[in-house]
């Protein structure tokens, strides 16, 4: 973990640029800056979001340009822009700095923003190094700034990946963890008494030799006992493999303002109380105007620094500032063995063959729970299913209304009429039957063995 720091020194017209002020706007205005950090120097980095982090500066002092007056030294926002990073510092990164002007005149809908300049810089930078200065031009503007990356203890090193302890500290965290990731000499140690064991002794003052627990003697060469580690504390020895527990990432609680600390692999995470945020819950006095709710969270209350705000988080985010992404796939929402994909803005289920639906809840090969609309019936067969639709309906689920007359079902010039329960054929003279398929003999008897009672030739015939 660590912090990237950016200091803006000046912003104004570049050499040879138009002698105009960034404040040339109608009415009062003020400047502010935003920084975006992306890992890597490659072209792909241009397509990635601000994965290392981003920060918005405070607004600068309000300035009203005086007509005919020369542009003064530009009032810039105070302080550093700080972008905390939780993981390793990548060493190579892309830096984007936006310079914005907020116009405080009487615009409809509140103050408007103007993007004055946007500079992009790709650099290699080791954490812990000195400030790097830079001058960048964007159009007629010139931006002068310095930046650095620094680790936050216990992290040290050019990538903030080594965990540091002072020479005088004990070796391991709680529970006798292996000490491989810990650096032994993060501070220049004092010169100890000649011959003092490098492994079992240490000194805080020059010329002394103090022993780690479990060792004794003037030079800390003598083990106190030969018993192996029985408790949590034991001799620090390469022969027993036991190490004295030392500080873990949460020891001493690095979280300020009542935040609670939880260890993560190689680092820690603070859960902040309402009203505080930041890597160590160090940012306070926040109101909704500061926009403390991340990832599209809606801020409610907190009109002044003494009153708390509440972030209403959008689906998929949680935490007092909506800063934590919920692992929605852990709830196993996809049924029937579907693969869960959390796309951030939505959950997707990739269904196994034979299943469908937003949560793979429909078994395509099963009539159970399968609804065929409009009186259709589900028929299984061949490892799949289909709907056998009632007359007048079609489609996979019998939801489409079919035109029963489309197939010209009435024979011998009979006229077809669609009817709510099917179709009706009005037969031409000399024919009868549901589809007008039977000729009427001259003696008035049809070719049917027996006509339904009450039907005369030429009557419309209903087809059930």
């Amino acid at each position: 973990a660590g912090v990237f720091e950016l200091q803006i020194h000046s912003f104004g017209p570049g050499p040879g640029g138009a002698p105009r002020s960034p404040y040339s706007a109608r009415g009062p205005c003020r400047l502010f800056f935003r920084v975006c950090l992306k890992p890597g120097l490659s072209e792909e980095a241009a397509e990635s979001p601000c994965a290392l982090g981003a920060a918005l500066s405070a607004r600068g002092p309000v300035y009203t340009e005086q007509p005919e007056a020369p542009a003064p030294d530009l009032p810039l926002p105070n302080g550093l822009l700080q972008v905390p990073f939780r993981d390793a510092w990548p060493g190579t990164f892309s830096l984007i700095i936006e310079t914005w002007r907020e116009e405080l005149g009487d615009q409809i809908g509140g103050p408007a923003w103007s993007l004055l300049a946007r500079v992009t810089r790709r650099r290699r930078l080791a954490a812990g190094g000195p400030w790097a200065g830079d001058i960048q031009r964007a159009g007629a503007w010139e931006l002068r700034f310095s930046y650095r990356a620094r680790c936050e203890l216990p992290a040290v090193g050019t990538a903030c990946t080594r965990l540091c302890r002072p020479r005088s500290a004990s070796r391991c965290g709680p529970g006798l963890r292996p000490c491989a990731p810990l650096e032994d000499e993060c501070e220049a140690p004092p010169v100890c008494r000649a011959g003092c064991s490098l492994e079992h002794g240490f000194c805080e003052q020059p010329g002394e030799c103090r022993c780690l627990e479990g060792w004794t003697g003037p030079l800390c060469m003598v083990p106190v006992s030969t018993s192996s580690c029985l408790g949590l504390r034991g001799p620090s020895s390469t022969t027993t493999g036991c190490l004295v527990p030392g500080p873990g990432p949460c020891d001493g609680n690095p979280c300020a303002n009542g935040g609670s600390c939880s260890e993560t692999p190689g680092s820690f995470e603070c859960t902040c109380p309402r009203g505080f945020y930041g890597l160590r819950c160090e940012v306070s006095g926040v109101t909704c105007a500061d926009g403390p709710c991340f990832n599209g969270g809606l801020c409610v209350g907190g009109a002044d620094p003494d009153s708390a705000y509440i972030c209403h988080c959008p689906p998929g985010f949680q935490g007092s500032n909506c800063e934590k992404r919920v692992d929605r796939c852990s709830l196993q929402p996809c049924r029937n063995g579907g693969l869960c994909l959390d796309l951030g803005h939505a959950l997707r289920c990739r269904c196994r063959a034979g299943f469908a639906g937003p949560r793979c809840e429909h078994d395509l090969n099963d009539c159970a729970g399968r609804a065929c609309a409009n009186g259709g019936t589900c028929v299984e067969g061949g490892g799949a299913h289909r709907c056998s639709c009632a007359l007048g309906f079609g489609g996979r689920d019998c939801r489409e209304r079919a035109d029963p007359c489309a197939a010209r079902p009435c024979a011998h010039g009979g006229r077809c009429y669609a009817h709510f329960s099917g179709l009706v054929c009005a037969c031409a003279p000399g024919y009868m039957g549901a589809r007008c398929e039977f000729p009427v003999h001259p003696d008035g008897v049809s070719a049917l063995p027996a006509a339904p009672p009450g039907l005369r030739p030429g009557d419309p015939q209903r087809y059930p």
């Epitope: 935003r34 397509e47 918005l56 103050p111 923003w113 991340f294 599209g296």
Partner: nanobody
Framework: QVQLVESGGGLVQAGGSLRLSCAAS????????MVWFRQAPGQEREFVGG????????AYADSVKGRFTFSRDNAKNTGYLQMSSLRPDDTAVYYC????????????????????WGHGTQVTVSS
């Protein structure tokens, strides 16, 4: 998922006006930044301006301030770019983009910060 469709582009004389629309479908976008970028042949995609996710305020590239205005109709899920006093160097394909981030401050001027994009509409300004 959000789908964005731009319309309203075309050929116009220098000094003329055009109004571009960006219609969003798929889900409500009232809490999204809805912004416009443009890309001239052989150039990088350039931020033009739009409305923030946080409070709907307008943000402008300095080069278009005073000539272009941005608005949105949340009921219609549509954003608008009204362009006037057009110049030949405004000729480009204009793209609409949307995202819920950043949660405060002006919208990002960096294309990679936007998840949703339209396919673009051509604006040609003749002299």
């Amino acid at each position: 998922q959000v789908q964005l469709v731009e319309s309203g582009g075309g050929l116009v004389q220098a000094g003329g006006s055009l109004r571009l629309s960006c219609a969003a479908s798929g889900r409500t976008t009232s809490r999204y930044s809805m912004v416009w970028f443009r890309q001239a042949p052989g150039q990088e995609r350039e931020f033009v301006g739009g409305n923030s996710a946080h409070d709907g305020r307008s943000a402008y590239a300095d080069s278009v301030k005073g000539r272009f205005t941005f608005s949105r109709d949340n009921a219609k899920n549509t954003g608008y770019l009204q362009m006037s006093s057009l110049r030949p160097d405004d000729t480009a394909v204009y793209y609409c983009a949307a995202d819920t981030n950043p949660p405060y401050g002006p919208p990002w001027s960096t294309p990679s910060e936007y998840e949703y994009w339209g396919h673009g509409t051509q604006v040609t300004v003749s002299s």
